[in-house]
């Protein structure tokens, strides 16, 4: 949950690609005004996930979830939250 | 803002060699089945995507990272 808060559109696109759902990917890409060549490039990546099957998608999703919830990212998220709190306090 | 570790993973997936990408994945999930899967996906992407495709994927990532939704 926390990871999606950091950059929700990234995780929208990533999980649409890894999920193999072309419609979902199109919807996500529309949100960032993707050009046709950009869509084509993302669909080539999506094809690799589709070709390699469900287990492959699950395993790669696991990797992304692990990285996103690692101390490398969570430490960053905590630091950003602290900075935000400082700014909010100073702003009052 | 996207986490730098995630950005690094995605950059290596697109612009690193398979060995470099797998080495990065191993830092987080060192299971043989996960690493083998990472290599298969990476090799597939390298086989399918041209230089231009990769440029386009990178330009899309720029849009994602600078989007108000990020």
């Amino acid at each position: 949950v926390k990871m999606a808060e950091t950059c929700p559109i990234f995780y929208d696109v990533f999980f649409a690609v890894a999920n193999g759902n072309e419609l979902l990917l199109d919807l996500s890409l529309t949100k960032v005004n993707a050009t046709e060549p950009e869509r084509t490039a993302m669909k080539k990546i999506q094809d690799c996930y589709v070709e390699n099957g469900l287990i492959s998608r699950v395993l790669d999703g696991l990797v992304m979830t692990t990285i996103s919830s690692s101390k490398d990212c969570m430490g960053e998220a905590v630091q950003n939250t602290v900075e935000d709190l400082k700014l909010n306090t100073l702003g009052r | 803002e996207i986490c730098p570790a995630v950005k690094r993973d995605v950059d290596l997936f697109l612009t690193g060699t398979p060995d470099e990408y797998v080495e990065q994945v191993a830092q987080y999930k060192a299971l043989p089945v996960v690493l083998e899967n990472a290599r298969i996906l990476k090799n597939c992407v390298d086989a399918k995507m041209t230089e231009e495709d990769k440029e386009n994927a990178l330009s899309l990532l720029d849009k994602i990272y600078t989007s108000p939704l990020c």
Epitope: - | P4, K7, R8, D11, L12, L14, T15, G16, T17, P18, D19, E20, E23, Q24, D46, M49, T50, E51, K54, E55, L58, S59, D62
Partner: antibody, heavy 119, light 107 residues
Amino acid sequence: EVQLVESGGGLVKPGGSLRLSCAASGFTFRNYNINWVRQAPGKGLEWVSLISGSSSYIYYADSVKGRFTVSRDNAKNSLYLQMNSLRAEDTAVYYCARRTLSYYVMDVWGQGTTVTVSS
Amino acid sequence: DIQVTQSPSPLSASVGDRVTITCRASQGISNYLAWYQQKPGRVPQLLIYAASTLQSGVPSRFSGSGSGTDFTLTISSLQPEDVATYYCQKYNSAPYTFGQGTKLEIK
């Protein structure tokens, strides 16, 4: 035309510092990984460092690790190599070279800039 | 780290000769091997990548082969303009080590 142009070389004393620059043109600089490669007088090529397009990953040769720092400014289409604690064996022509996205080889090289470390 | 060894060096051959330069990696690198040509006083130029793929604009007399640990660069018919030093480079992962170079001269 795709081009890389190095600058900043010169004569420096052992233990001194120097900052090399590499100006890129003719391609979308921010997308490409760039290498530094050096060549000592009359010797072969030695890979020094690589920096990714967004600086998210950086690699160094053991011979320069802890002394050299690579960085880039994508807004200025520029790459830098900060060289500290220079030694006589760092004397070389320094090239920047673009790494292709699809095959990971150096397809475009600059003309090189000469660094001489001598007292 | 993986070591890369080139042989022979130097190499002297006659115009029209078939010339072969070898490169050996201390561990398997699949086909992640490139060959570069450096003419005297000039900047290195990419000749071959992925062990056997000719870079655009490179004459067809140049060819590469091999996989794993043993690789070769072949010039089918040596031309005067081929006088240069040839370097192999492994690029599967950092450090991207170069071979020591093979200086090719005309007899």
